[in-house]
């Protein structure tokens, strides 16, 4: 038995910053899990790990170097990430992996969310133009 | 009830390798990450690496060079190995349970390194 | 790597009293900090995570704060079983790293 997994198609980070919300064909609510974000076609890169035990404070953390943060639904769990660059516009997978009660369970690997990540704005605003030329 | 079990060669000499095992009873094997942590006799903690059910691993940089780590899931075990050893390497090595925090640990191990 | 650093080394209290035990972050590591109690021959024992979380069968006395890069465990009331080693451990960053402990002795 594999748990399903549904992402968002693409999302854009535009202030270098997105949510992506991993939704789960399973309820998490009193199980202890681990739920991970994934970069790249391989999954090699492991973004965030959120890691849940019954009812104690979730933990969340990222080994990779990523800004992370993550919130927990009964049957999803979402991924903040801050600081993003522009060169980690990539592919996306939501993994997530139940220990107890048993069976293990892991989820069928999922479409992945494309992130795309726009560069902060750095032209000068209207309102403040830059010096005028001669 | 999680119980870790170690076991391996206490007395080595300089430029030998290391070599521990943990068996892990009850509870799931898969999910969590295994680690392995050391402590210098008098001294404070040192995680060294760790270890998931499919062979995912993360090591200190500053002990990468020397340490594989690897894991059996048909007998719920994982494994150190620790090459060439020198006297700082003597310590009790502990195995754990737990990536970010180790929630269950093995009764530890002392290994002594001399000539 | 992130550098954690306790204080005082040696803390001297008498059963019933306050201890108060801070550990220091070289850089943010938000609220990933954890505790452990080590007493000699056995091994450490998870008391707090996420700076202030107690981790399942810790006694109410032991309280953990802090954010950041300063961090404290507080433990209320001193029982005879709680004289011991006390170390903070950061999981913000890879490597895992430990301080070098608060040992906690009889006044």
């Known amino acids: 038995n594999k748990i399903l997994v549904k992402q968002s198609p693409m999302l854009v980070a535009y202030d270098n910053a997105v949510n992506l919300s991993c939704k789960y064909s399973y309820n998490l609510f009193s199980r202890e899990f681990r739920a991970s974000l994934h970069k790249g076609l391989d999954s090699a890169v492991e973004v965030c790990v959120v890691y849940g035990n019954y009812s104690q404070q979730l933990q969340v953390y990222s080994k990779t170097g990523f800004n992370c943060d993550g919130k927990l639904g009964n049957e999803s769990v979402t991924f903040y990430l801050q600081n993003l660059y522009v060169n980690q516009t990539d592919i996306y997978f939501c993994k997530i992996e139940v220990m107890y009660p048993p069976p293990y369970l892991d989820n069928e690997k999922s479409n992945g969310t494309i992130i795309h990540v726009k560069g902060k704005h750095l032209c000068p605003s209207p309102l403040f133009p830059g010096p005028s030329k001669p | 009830q999680v119980q870790l079990q170690q076991w391996g060669a206490g007395l080595l000499k300089p430029s030998e390798t290391l070599s521990l095992t943990c068996a892990v009873y009850?509870?799931?094997?898969?999910?969590?990450?295994w680690n392995w942590i050391r402590q210098p006799p008098g001294k404070g903690l040192q995680w060294i690496g760790e270890?998931?059910?499919?062979?995912?691993?993360n090591y200190n940089p500053s002990l990468k060079s020397r340490v594989t780590i690897s894991v059996d899931t048909s007998k719920n075990q994982f494994s150190l190995k620790l090459s060439s050893l020198t006297a700082a390497d003597t310590a009790v090595y502990y195995c754990?349970?737990?990536?970010?925090?180790?929630?269950?640990w093995g009764q530890g191990t002392l290994v002594t390194v001399s000539s | 790597e992130i550098v954690m650093t306790q204080s005082p080394a040696t803390l001297s209290v008498s059963p019933g009293e306050r201890a108060t035990l801070s550990c220091r972050a070289s850089q943010s590591v938000n609220s990933n900090l954890a505790w452990y109690q080590q007493k000699p021959g056995q091994a450490p024992r998870l008391l707090i995570y996420g700076a202030s979380a107690r981790a399942t069968g810790i006694p109410a006395r032991f309280s953990g704060s802090g954010s950041g890069t300063e961090f404290t465990l507080t433990i209320s009331s001193l029982q005879s079983e709680d004289f011991a080693v006390y170390y903070c451990q950061q999981y913000y960053n890879w490597p895992l790293t430990f301080g070098g402990g608060t040992k906690v002795e009889i006044k």
């Open positions: 270890i998931n059910h499919s062979g995912t691993t």
């Open positions: 754990a349970r737990g990536e970010a925090v180790a929630l269950y």
């Open positions: 009850g509870g799931s094997f898969s999910g969590y990450y």
